[in-house]
């Protein structure tokens, strides 16, 4: 049978030939009649055999990490017979390990993110090194991890490569750290090989900073002509945090006047001061408001960093704008009696310059030939007024600043012309009446009514009478109905068309004004030839008379 021990050959041997061992047949008596042969991968190139003795030699430097064992076949032949002495047999040559490989970090680059202010012991990342040497061969591949750079903020567990936080870090002071980890084999004993890796550790932000105003005092200006909603300026706070943690909200802390507001521009993180109520330079021209700023998102556990909001004071100066004159009233109503002489006093309007400089005011009336106004605002008449032509005048009065003629205000002035009794009553229409020749006494000839162009103070009352002459002639008489109408009646029986074809009756109409006015109005009465049935035979006005319902008998 075959005789051999286990074969080992150390890797990395520099000698040209290294004795590995010997294989032989127990039938070999040493007389050199046997020939040993080596077959398989590596035979003849890596390993050779002494054909006579069976001694095996390694003729190449071996690398266990490249190949840790060789499986070869051995033959032994009797030279004399040429026959195999032993059956062909397989044997193994193991390459024994030496510590020729340093630890290597295969998962580089390492990068980790950890929240700032994380407590001690927080796990950051685990790094792992590999050693190509034989883990089963002593300590060649037994690794120990240590920190070369990163103290005092980080530590590494020696056997696991777990990196932990060993001191709280503030992202706002430093937002990333390079940690260098060393792995040593031979558990750090002398002769150990080492490898290093760098770990980039980035700190993620937590909201541990409140926003703080850049300035403790701001100065803004606003024109008094600015409409509500106008942006009058911006204020700015800074937050050392980033992203959502730096989003902030501005608000008013103090503004007794409630004139201003602050809105937040969430894109620029600026506070925009806006006008909430219109300002008036003459009323108040200096304002002071206090603004505060807070983070938009604050976690409950981080409230300790946000106890007192940062504030700033904003001085706001109102800029004067030259304003037009201001009338005491939005409109004026004056009264004046008609027929008063020209130059009569109507009323006084008053406007003032609302600005501090108090410019004198000039007044004018737009397009009026009837009224005049002086620099004191006194309105007078330029003509006598007739209420019956115009009872009201709508004037437009303009006030202009003497020092700035572009500053103009206008208001309406209404002038009511009051009535005086300057018109007598008169017939409400033209009357023509008709009487039959054969009319009897007391016949109603005409009902008349009157109008008065004057305005009635309470109610017009008219009084109707015949003139003295007509009263004396007594052909007709008048009855006042006491309702501003009167009736004309015949005062005799029979009329003669040939002798007196027409009567002209003078009727006096008086009003109840003080003093009373009276007018004389003429009523024309035509005499008509009527038949017995009352139908007219000769009367040019008969159609009209009949249509008006007059009936003659």
């Amino acid at each position: 049978g075959w005789v051999w021990n286990q074969f080992f050959v150390p890797e990395e041997m520099n000698t040209t030939s290294h004795h590995v061992g010997r294989l032989r047949s127990d039938l070999d008596n040493g007389n050199n009649s046997f020939q040993y042969k080596l077959l398989g991968a590596g035979a003849g190139s890596t390993f050779i055999i002494d054909e006579r003795t069976g001694d095996i030699y390694a003729i190449e430097k071996l690398d266990r990490e490249e190949r840790s064992l060789y499986i070869l076949r051995a033959q032994v032949i009797d030279i004399t017979t040429g026959r195999a002495v032993e059956p062909e047999s397989e044997f193994v040559i193991k390459v024994s390990d030496i510590n020729d490989n340093e630890p290597k970090f295969l998962d580089e680059p390492y990068e980790a993110i950890v929240p700032e202010m994380s407590p001690e012991g927080t796990l950051v990342i685990q790094v792992t090194a590999s050693d190509a040497d034989d883990p089963s061969s002593g300590n060649n591949a037994r690794l120990l991890y240590s920190l070369l750079q990163g103290q005092p903020y980080f530590s590494v567990e020696p056997t696991t490569g777990v990196i932990r936080i060993s001191s709280k870090m503030d992202r706002e002071l430093q937002d990333e750290y390079w940690v260098i980890i060393q792995a040593k084999d031979m558990i750090g004993q002398p002769g150990a090989l080492s490898g290093t890796t760098s770990v980039l550790i980035k700190l993620s932000d937590v909201n541990d900073n409140k926003p703080i105003f850049k300035e403790s005092l701001y100065r803004l200006t606003v024109s008094e002509s600015a409409p509500t909603g106008t942006s009058i300026g911006t204020i700015m706070a800074y937050d050392n945090d980033i992203g959502e943690n730096a989003e902030m909200d501005y608000s008013i802390e103090e503004d007794d006047s409630q004139t201003f507001d602050i809105i937040t521009n969430h894109e620029t993180q600026e506070g925009i001061v806006i006008l909430k109520k219109k300002v008036n330079f003459e009323h108040q021209n200096h304002y002071g408001i206090r603004a505060k700023v807070k983070n938009h998102h604050v976690d409950e556990q981080l409230m300790k960093y946000h106890t007192e909001a940062s504030t700033t004071f904003i001085k706001i100066q109102v800029e004067d704008v030259d304003e037009p004159p201001l009338f005491l009233l939005p409109y004026y109503i004056f009264e004046i009696f008609e027929e008063t002489p020209q130059g009569s006093f109507v009323g006084v309007v008053s406007a003032t310059d609302p600005d501090n400089r108090k410019s004198p005011i000039r007044y004018s009336i737009t397009r009026s030939k009837v009224f005049n106004i002086d620099d004191n605002g006194t309105i007078t008449t330029t003509n006598s007024l007739d209420r019956e032509i115009s009872a009201w005048y709508n004037l437009s009065i303009t006030a202009t600043e003497k020092y700035n003629i572009e500053q103009i205000s206008s208001i309406p002035v209404y002038v009511q012309v009051l009535n005086i009794n300057d018109h007598a009553p008169e017939f409400s229409q033209y009357y023509e009446s008709y009487v039959c020749e054969n009319a009897g006494s007391g016949q109603v000839i005409q009902t008349i009514s009157a109008v008065d162009r004057d305005e009635s103070i309470e109610e017009h009352h008219f009084y109707f009478n015949l003139s003295v002459e007509d009263t004396n002639s007594s052909s007709f008489t008048i009855i006042d109905n006491q309702d501003n109408t009167a009736v004309i009646l015949t005062n005799r029986t029979g009329f003669n068309l040939q002798e007196e074809p027409i009567f002209y009756i003078s009727i006096l109409i008086a009003d109840n004004g003080i003093p009373s006015l009276t007018s004389t109005n003429t009523l024309t009465i035509h005499v008509c030839d009527c038949d017995d049935s009352g139908s007219t035979q000769t009367c040019q006005y008969q159609e009209l008379m009949l249509s008006m319902g007059f009936k003659t008998e």
Epitope: R219, D256, E282, N285, H286, Y287, G288, F313, K315
Partner: antibody, heavy 120, light 107 residues
């Protein structure tokens, strides 16, 4: 701490122009948000505000004195100045320069004042 | 302009007593726009109170301010010998005007 110091002639003839300068120390006249004022006090009387200036040169005056007053600023010298024209005896007063406050328009810092007499 | 009236013109009190000085405005002013000053002879005025109840830096707490609308008060809780001097109120909302002053003298 901010300190203010007035300087200028103590005697001015009627109809002439009164000129005073206020020098600021312990702080910059260009500090954001602060206004620099002139105030006067007639002998034995109350205080009268004359006007103020901002470091940008923007000024605002008491309407009753506006036509005669000019206030200017020189940021390089940390000074601001008052000119009051056409003076009369009624302008005889102690003239103070002052700076307003950090929380309002009140006068927080004052100079010690300088007496200006208008007399021929 | 807003006119400030101070009363009384003179207040005669003894050290240790309480002083109440009044300042009245001709029209409403926001309480945030009133200040009080103390002026000693030959000196510049010194800010005491602003807004109208905030004490200026270094002002003892015996000085206090109050009021709103048109009526404002400066109170000195216990008069010290150095408090006997002149006090002015000032409004700073509509331009700047001072009151005529109240003199606190020793009775």
């Amino acid at each position: 701490q901010v300190q203010l110091q007035e300087s200028g002639p103590g005697l001015v003839k009627p109809s002439q122009t009164l000129s005073l300068t206020c020098t600021v120390s312990g702080g910059s006249i260009s500090s954001s948000g602060y206004y620099w004022s002139w105030i006067r006090q007639h002998p034995g009387k109350g205080l009268e505000w004359i006007g103020y200036i901002y470091y940008t040169g923007s000024a605002y005056y008491n309407p009753s004195l506006k036509s005669r007053v000019t206030i200017s600023v020189d940021t390089s010298k940390n000074q601001f100045s008052l000119k009051l024209s056409s003076v009369t005896a009624a302008d005889t007063a102690v003239y103070y320069c002052a700076r307003d406050g950090s929380s309002g328009w009140y006068f927080q810092y004052w100079g010690q004042g300088t007496l200006v007499t208008v007399s021929s | 302009e807003i006119v400030l009236t101070q009363s009384p013109g003179t207040l005669s009190l003894s050290p240790g007593e309480r002083a109440t000085l009044s300042c009245r405005a001709s029209r409403n002013i926001s309480s945030s726009y009133l200040a009080w000053y103390q002026q000693k002879p030959g000196q510049a005025p010194r800010l005491l109170i602003y807004g109208p109840s905030s004490r200026a830096t270094g002002i003892p707490d015996r000085f206090s301010g109050s009021g709103s609308g048109t009526d404002f008060t400066l109170t000195i809780s216990r008069l010290e010998p150095e408090d006997f001097t002149v006090y002015y109120c000032q409004q700073y909302g509509s331009s700047f005007t001072f009151g005529p002053g109240t003199k606190v003298d020793i009775k």
